[in-house]
Interface confidence: low
């Protein structure tokens, strides 16, 4: 089961090498646990494997397996990172017919400094 409003250790292998090691679910796309998020991430692996952007893996992990700090703050990916990745990878997204989730549309995300990210309280819905 999923612990209510507490950070949990990352178990998705692809994201275990990120600079953060705790996450929170559900994520922006409503995936309620890491196993579902991992399966959904598989659709995006052509982008990561072909390295369409140097930031692709960071973005995918921050989106699907978001950073969680101090138990109550979930950190979504920043808009600038999203825009960079989407711009870099647009051609491949089209080539592979990858559906970009509307929850990850860049204009829904906030501008923030990647080193000091905007956080949101998981008790409320994140609207960007």
């Amino acid at each position: 089961g999923h612990s209510l409003f507490t950070c949990e250790p990352i178990t998705v292998p692809r994201c275990m090498k990120m600079a953060y090691n705790m996450t929170f679910f559900p994520n922006l796309m409503g995936h309620y646990d890491q196993s579902i998020a991992a399966v959904e991430m598989e659709h995006f692996l052509p982008l990561a494997n072909l390295e369409c952007s140097p930031n692709i893996e960071t973005f995918l992990c921050k989106a699907f397996v978001p950073t969680c700090i101090e138990q109550i703050h979930v950190v979504p990916p920043c808009r600038k990172l999203c825009e960079k990745v989407y711009s870099d990878c647009k051609k491949l997204i089209d080539t592979f017919g990858i559906r970009w989730p509307e929850e990850l549309e860049c204009d829904r995300l906030q501008y923030c400094d990647e080193t000091v990210p905007v956080t949101f309280d998981p008790h409320t819905e994140f609207l960007g």
């Epitope: 390295e51 369409c52 140097p54 491949l92």
Partner: antibody, heavy 119, light 107 residues
Framework: QVQLVQSGAEVKKPGASVKVSCKAS????????ISWVRQAPGQGLEWMGR????????SYAQNFQGRVTMTRDTSTSTVYMELSSLRSEDTAVYYC????????????WGQGTLVTVSS | DIQMTQSPSSLSASVGDRVTITCRAS??????LNWYQQKPGKAPKLLIY???SLQSGVPSRFSGSGSGTDFTLTISSLQPEDFATYYC?????????FGGGTKVEIK
């Protein structure tokens, strides 16, 4: 099936440069990430860096930074590795190999190119 | 950089023997570990990827296990064509690094 064919053996003098080619076939060229790995005589394997055929994005191992340049030619589905300021310790077999991703495993490998550095 | 340490560096075995080679990473690499076989004068050949997945076309006598820092390559029944050098490689982070190799020789 996917195949990587490398250029032939080279003999170079210390201080010179060498450029090794690796021609890919069997899949869309943009679907390749090519790594270069070298092996000195009787020694183990050493990763030098990689290049994405899709967008030319590269990453070099620190040991080779400043001396290695990896490029691609999409018109001929060929990747190149140039190593400059050669020294005797650079005598090795140089392999290109397809990476499963920008980090990953290597399969298949080219047949190898022996580069001998000798005065 | 992540250091990969293989042991033993060489071993002697007979056809039919069960052979085990170990590889240790200097830090946790999850299951980002691959195994290769190399014969003299030839390029390495991928045997196992992601710690335990058998590469297509590789005989089932080869198997891999482990996670974190400790990994094992096992050949369940050594065949004449298996005498070669075996390398592990981590694909957790760049620079990608290899173990020093294990040479499997005929006893």
């Amino acid at each position: 099936q996917v195949q990587l064919v490398q250029s032939g053996a080279e003999v170079k003098k210390p201080g010179a440069s060498v450029k090794v080619s690796c021609k890919a076939s069997g899949d869309t060229f943009s679907n390749y990430v090519i790594s270069w790995v070298r092996q000195a005589p009787g020694q183990g394997l050493e990763w030098m860096g990689r290049i994405s055929a899709y967008n030319g994005y590269k990453s070099y191992a620190q040991n080779f930074q400043g001396r290695v340049t990896m490029t691609r030619d999409t018109s001929t589905s060929t990747v190149y590795m140039e190593l400059s300021s050669l020294r005797s310790e650079d005598t090795a077999v140089y392999y290109c190999a397809r990476s499963s991703g920008y980090v990953g495993w290597f399969d298949p490998w080219g047949q190898g190119t022996l580069v001998t550095v000798s005065s | 950089d992540i250091q990969m340490t293989q042991s033993p560096s060489s071993l002697s075995a007979s056809v039919g023997d069960r052979v085990t080679i170990t590889c240790r990473a200097s830090q946790s690499i999850s299951s980002y570990l691959n195994w290769y076989q190399q014969k003299p004068g030839k390029a390495p050949k991928l045997l196992i990827y992601a710690a335990s997945s058998l590469q297509s076309g590789v005989p089932s006598r080869f198997s891999g296990s482990g996670s974190g820092t400790d990994f094992t390559l096992t050949i369940s029944s050594l065949q004449p064509e298996d005498f070669a050098t075996y390398y592990c490689q981590q694909s957790y982070s760049t620079p990608l690094t290899f173990g020093g190799g294990t040479k499997v020789e005929i006893k």
